[in-house]
């Protein structure tokens, strides 16, 4: 018969756990919301602002499956941050976007790990911001979809 | 249909000031960048700078900035380009042309400047 | 400033292949277009986000870019597709427009 101590043990394990995933779904939930809003202000200035976006090429992984694939995501953040430069004006200020890719970059780093030894393989095809940002959004919700609540 | 009328051909001296114009119909003017494109005699095109007459943001090629200025007026949805002063260098045939941002469904296709004028020749001589 | 680099002239036999290349430091990162300008005309839009056709364009013209180029390849080339081609892209910036030089097709 498993001991008290034993039993308390697994216990714990079980909640931490449970804590862990709990936190994932919520910087998943995060990741989700600031891909949202950055696709929603680029819509949101269409005419003014997307057609300048538009001529910027992103790439994106051949297949994105788990978390580790988030690697992907973190090593377009530089192109992506290049993009949001020439929204600043009225639409949106540089400290904002510079804001915005620096709290994707925790996010990611915290939901894939800090390690980087993982190597991204990119799809040949490349896409536009606006299909890039709605393929990560996508992403996002097949696995929070997926997650044990 | 949508499109782009410019003005006339122009025959100016040296020193002398110069304004042509675009005008567009056909779509909401105030919606979309017109560029501004130079193609001296016998050579090739060179993007000059751009407009969106709904703000009137303005961007100049750095070869082109100091060199002439890009101005819209939405009420009568007309772009233009002018110089202060004319050099015998700007005799070249200008296009206007308009960049065309389509949203088909939720997808959007960018095809850069695909509805052009019929150009304004512009001829500086002494 | 950026340049995007096209060669001056291209010979073609008619039903032949036409390649015409443009090179630019930027163009892994950016995505060209392509106009046709034939004599005494306004440009005419050919090809659009490297690969793309718009419609009315004759399915001949292609595009591809991998790397720093970019190319446009007239498959069965015809007497009529005789013009100046240039390719067309933003700077890194993406705050400036830049035409290559320009490549005379001749159809022979």
């Known amino acids: 018969a498993p001991t008290s101590s034993s039993t308390s043990s697994s216990t714990a394990e079980a909640q931490q756990q449970q804590q862990q995933q709990q936190q994932q779904q919520q910087h998943l939930e995060q990741l989700l919301m600031d891909l949202q809003e950055l696709l929603s202000r680029m819509e949101n200035y269409r005419n003014l602002k997307l057609p300048r976006m538009l001529t910027f090429k992103f790439y994106l992984p051949k297949q994105a499956t788990e978390l580790k694939d988030l690697q992907c995501l973190e090593d377009e953040l530089g192109p992506l941050r290049h993009v949001l430069d020439l929204t600043q004006s009225k639409s949106f200020q540089l400290e904002d976007a510079e804001n915005f890719i620096s709290n994707i970059r925790v996010t990611v780093v915290k939901l894939k790990g800090s390690d980087n030894t993982f190597e991204c393989q990119f799809d040949d095809e490349s896409a536009t911001v606006v299909d890039f940002l709605r393929r990560w959004i996508a992403f996002c919700q097949s696995i929070i979809s997926t997650s044990p609540q | 249909q949508v499109q782009l009328v410019q003005s006339g051909a122009e025959v100016k001296k040296p020193g002398e000031s110069l304004k042509i114009s675009c005008k567009g119909s056909?779509?909401?003017?105030?919606?979309?960048?017109i560029g501004w494109v130079r193609q001296m005699p016998g050579k090739g095109l060179e993007w000059m700078g751009i407009i969106y007459p709904g703000d009137s943001d303005t961007r100049y090629s750095p070869s082109f900035q100091g060199q002439v200025t890009i101005s819209a007026d939405k009420s009568i949805s007309t772009a233009y380009l002018q110089w202060s002063s004319l050099k015998a260098s700007d005799t070249a045939m200008y296009y206007c042309?308009?960049?065309?941002?389509?949203?088909?469904?939720?997808?959007?296709?960018?095809?850069?400047?695909?509805?052009w004028g019929q150009g304004t020749t512009v001829t500086v001589s002494s | 400033s950026y340049e995007l680099t096209q060669p001056p002239s291209v010979s073609v036999s008619p039903g032949q292949t036409a390649r015409i290349t443009c090179s630019g430091d930027?163009?892994?990162?950016?995505?060209a277009y392509w106009y046709q300008q034939k004599s005494g005309q306004a440009p005419v839009l050919v090809i659009y986000e490297d690969s793309k056709r718009p419609s009315g364009i004759p399915e001949r013209f292609s595009g591809s870019s991998s790397g720093t180029m970019a190319t446009l390849t007239i498959s069965g080339a015809q007497v009529e597709d005789e013009a100046d081609y240039y390719c067309?892209?933003?700077?890194?910036?993406?705050?400036?427009?830049?035409f290559g030089g320009g490549t005379k097709v001749t159809v022979l």
């Open positions: 042309a308009r960049e065309t941002l389509a949203a088909v469904g939720s997808n959007y296709y960018y095809y850069g400047m695909d509805v």
């Open positions: 930027a163009l892994p990162r950016k995505y």
């Open positions: 056909g779509y909401s003017f105030t919606s979309y960048w």
């Open positions: 067309y892209s933003t700077d890194r910036s993406g705050n400036f427009w830049v």
